[in-house]
Amino acid sequence: PSGLVTANITDSEALARWQPAIATVDSYVISYTGEKVPEITRTVSGNTVEYALTDLEPATEYTLRIFAEKGPQKSSTITAKFTTDLDSPRDLTATEVQSETALLTWRPPRASVTGYLLVYESVDGTVKEVIVGPDTTSYSLADLSPSTHYTAKIQALNGPLRSNMIQTIFTTIGLLYPFPKDCSQAMLNGDTTSGLYTIYLNGDKAEALEVFCDMTSDGGGWIVFLRRKNGRENFYQNWKAYAAGFGDRREEFWLGLDNLNKITAQGQYELRVDLRDHGETAFAVYDKFSVGDAKTRYKLKVEGYSGTAGDSMAYHNGRSFSTFDKDTDSAITNCALSYKGAFWYRNCHRVNLMGRYGDNNHSQGVNWFHWKGHEHSIQFAEMKLRPSNFRNLEGRRKRA
């Protein structure tokens, strides 16, 4: 025979074809072997010109031999080489599908691989590719879009060889709150890590605001609006600065009175204050908290105390905000000026969390009177808020 070729090569099959001998022959003897694969020999009829090779090993170079037989006579042997395809991974499945995450799992191919190419594509045409290592059989997809159909495909790699792709289709869960109006809604969407998030005032996507969410304290879902921790930020700022907000939301900052007014106008909110000093901790929670608008000079409402820090905010209830350049307190002197801070001063304060960091002079420092008095500046303080009915919302989500 002559012209031995292989066609239709897959990971486990190939078709051998040849030109027949000129003379009439009784049979053809076909043998094939690969590295680490024992030789297989088959005899076929002399009028056959092709033979299907099956049960081949994937990603293996085979040597194929064929000769003709007529009676006791044997023709010379002709040889061809071919390499089987890399077999595909199997059983690609998407599990633990959430609004923005999913877990892909698969079974490895029989052949050894140098890695996998994962491709996932949303219906809007957004395509992402990632290469993972050879020992990996699962991969967590993140930053997916909620309520979106995805096609995930996987292909095994072995050097230059690539398997066929297999695919699975899944749909992410719709967000409970596509435009969360506070950190509690972000949390109910499944975000449970403290850090920076975008919220949307009144759920309006045009009213985006970056906030720091505390997702751990007492069940989480808190918008942090004040943090003192190291004294790097200057809190002796004017009215305009306190209205707008200032600082780094990962470090020391004030979120801004305008933002507090807009957030607390969305519904009934509670206030939590966390204090830490030399290993001691204390907290105060007020189940009613709101900040009025600029016309009221950001009037404070704070009621319904519980906690361990002592009810120091009660003294400030009903007061307007004061800064050194806008004195709205009830003192003859300017409290903000006297105590180098800003707050809902009265005459003057039980709480001075925007006071001078580290200043232990009477009433000048970061004070919470009913915890550490006025002659001790507290090392760490955070003020934060979340909806008063958060516990009910959380319970509803868990049942769902």
């Epitope: 009810d311 009830s330 003859i332 002197t333 009265r346 009477h362």
Partner: antibody, heavy 120, light 107 residues
Framework: QVQLVESGGGLVQPGRSLRLSCAAS????????MHWVRQAPGKGLEWVSG????????YYADSVKGRFTISRDNAKNSLYLQMNSLRAEDTALYYC?????????????WGQGTMVTVSS | DIQMTQSPASLPTPVGDRVTITCRAS??????LNWYQQKPGKAPKLLIY???NLETGVPSRFSGSGSGTDFTLTISSLQPEDFATYYC?????????FGQGTKVDIK
């Protein structure tokens, strides 16, 4: 109008007990801290005890700590002072006083007082 | 406890005169100071809270000032109905303490 009316005073022997009451009207009682302040005959004012709006927190002057107990019944708009182990120096006119909104340590409404005389 | 010291103890004053009563705290109390008026046989009445704020219904001839440890109650022009005993009270810390009183009587 806002009103506080004390009752329960009288003559009592040293070591005995007495319970003072204060009936409040004209305001949302459980929104406010309430206090007892006393005035010995011909003397100045002395704060005795205070209680938060919910009744969850109570405070006492050192001179009465361990002997007097302040309490309130918000359903009845009433404030009480249970006085045990009475001494001659507890003789005074006892005023019930309403705290202002907020901390409640400023007394904006006072009753007319009830006289307690401790004498053998 | 915070001691409150009032002076003078007694202040004979003619009608129409200006009256000044001082009150000193034994420690710094910001503006946590109140003034009360008590007439014979009557309960005390709140006049000034937070050192300088006039209680509703109190005539404007009464005023308060001061911060920290030193405070003053002023009656700009003494009227016959103002003859009474005046007490300062600190609301800075428990126990809330009163001054010993200043008796303003007719000269």
């Amino acid at each position: 109008q806002v009103q506080l009316v004390e009752s329960g005073g009288g003559l009592v022997q040293p070591g005995r007990s007495l319970r003072l009451s204060c009936a409040a009207s004209g305001f949302t009682f459980d929104d406010y801290a309430m206090h007892w302040v006393r005035q010995a005959p011909g003397k100045g004012l002395e704060w005795v005890s205070g209680i938060s709006g919910s009744g969850g927190s109570t405070y006492y002057a050192d001179s009465v700590k361990g002997r007097f107990t302040i309490s309130r019944d918000n359903a009845k708009n009433s404030l009480y002072l249970q006085m045990n182990s009475l001494r001659a120096e507890d003789t005074a006119l006892y005023y019930c006083a309403k705290g202002t909104r907020g901390e409640g340590d400023t007394f904006d409404i006072w009753g007319q007082g009830t006289m307690v005389t401790v004498s053998s | 406890d915070i001691q409150m010291t009032q002076s003078p103890a007694s202040l004979p004053t003619p009608v129409g005169d200006r009256v000044t009563i001082t009150c000193r705290a034994s420690q710094y109390i910001q503006g946590f100071l109140n003034w009360y008026q008590q007439k014979p046989g009557k309960a005390p009445k709140l006049l000034i809270y937070d050192a300088s704020n006039l209680e509703t219904g109190v005539p404007s001839r009464f005023s308060g000032s001061g911060s920290g440890t030193d405070f003053t109650l002023t009656i700009s022009s003494l009227q016959p109905e103002d003859f009474a005993t005046y007490y300062c009270q600190q609301s800075y810390s428990t126990p809330q303490t009163f001054g010993q009183g200043t008796k303003v009587d007719i000269k």
